[in-house]
């Protein structure tokens, strides 16, 4: 196996402009508590300008491995993906990866055009397309649309449900031929049965030979990952396998394993 992604001693700060933007967003939300009594952790990693969003991060993924990234809100999970994509520059340390990246964002987007155009972009490979449609649980939805996958979405087109949007967004990312797939909480708008099926058929099977970084909070996903990175306030709290996680000091392990 060849090493696909390496991060060594990486620390990063959002630029001052970003810090101010997020600080303003945080102030706008400071009265909005979540209903179950928890303080909203929205943008909590930007609470102080000049605070690093990621601190001394180290990990290495081999080609074809699945890295699960977990952590509380504001821990730096999305920032980590932004850094791999080059949207966030490290102030220290180095990042190496082997090239083409495909990204599935946490909040899906649809462009005006047909379902097929939304997924394939430019080059069309029939077998690849059909495999992706099946793995992302879109076959049944598409069969119900009047024009099947030539049904127009967006302005003047049909309206999709949140789950359909999420699956099309994931299909778009998976269809793209890349060296590294970054999946940022792609199951947030899916029902649990569909999520389980897609995680198995798409992330674990169809993409089995691909290098994948999956941001997730689900214990079930952590168990299936080759490596796990748990972030806490921008730092790496844990990096290793699930069995290593289980072998941590008993108090943490018992809390983690329930």
């Amino acid at each position: 196996t060849t090493t696909e992604v390496v991060m060594e001693n990486v620390t990063a700060f959002w630029e001052e402009g970003f810090g101010e933007l997020f600080e303003k967003a945080k102030q706008n939300n400071n009265n909005r508590k979540t209903s179950n009594g928890d303080d909203s952790l929205f943008f909590s990693n930007f609470s102080l300008l000049g605070t690093p969003v990621l601190k001394d991060i180290n990990f290495k993924i081999e080609r074809g491995q699945l890295l699960a990234v977990a952590g509380s809100t504001g821990a730096g999970k999305t920032s980590l993906l932004m850094m791999i994509m080059g949207e966030l520059e490290p102030s220290e340390g180095k990042i190496k990866h082997s090239g083409r990246i495909s990204f599935c964002p946490q909040f899906s987007w649809i462009m005006p055009g047909t379902i097929k155009e939304n997924i394939i972009g430019v080059s069309y490979d029939e077998y690849r397309y059909r495999s992706v449609i099946k793995a992302c649980q879109l076959e049944e939805d598409i069969s119900k649309f009047p024009e099947k996958d030539n049904t127009v979405l967006g302005e003047g087109g049909i309206t999709l449900s949140g789950g359909q949007r999420a699956r099309i967004s994931l299909a778009r990312a998976v269809y793209k031929d890349a060296d590294l797939y970054l999946l940022d909480s792609p199951f947030g708008y899916l029902d649990v049965l569909t999520e389980k099926e897609i995680f198995e058929s798409c992330v674990c099977k169809l993409m089995a030979n691909k290098t994948r970084i999956l941001v997730t909070s689900k214990m079930e996903h952590l168990k299936k990952a080759d490596k796990i990175l748990i972030l806490h306030e921008g730092s790496s709290y844990f990096y290793g396998t699930f069995s290593e996680l289980q072998n941590l000091q008993p108090d943490f392990s018992s809390k983690l394993m329930g």
Partner: nanobody, 123 residues
Framework: QVQLQESGGGLVQAGSSLRLACAAT????????MGWYRQAPGKQRGMVAI???????DYADSVKGRFTISRDNAKNTVYLQMNSLKPEDTATYYC?????????????????WGQGTQVTVSS
Amino acid sequence: QVQLQESGGGLVQAGSSLRLACAATGSIRSINNMGWYRQAPGKQRGMVAIITRVGNTDYADSVKGRFTISRDNAKNTVYLQMNSLKPEDTATYYCHAEITEQSRPFYLTDDYWGQGTQVTVSS
């Protein structure tokens, strides 16, 4: 120990309404997605409706416009208002929640299911 308990099922006539409730109890830190699923005899379990923590909803095509899902985060409870019920809505209705227990660090979640409540719609 976390538990989900459904209530509100029963036998009703076609065209009438029912309201299901599902309360999550135990050592709960937070709940992400909650949802209702149903299983008719000899059929696979399928999604009816889901609701995210911030209130975004999604419905199965067969119930759109008739069923409404809602939640009360303060009470860790999810509801399903079912109007214009049809005989084909007859099934056992199960509640699901993606829960972080109090003892779990980093908001890691597990899936929990209720025992189910029977809804029978006669014609």
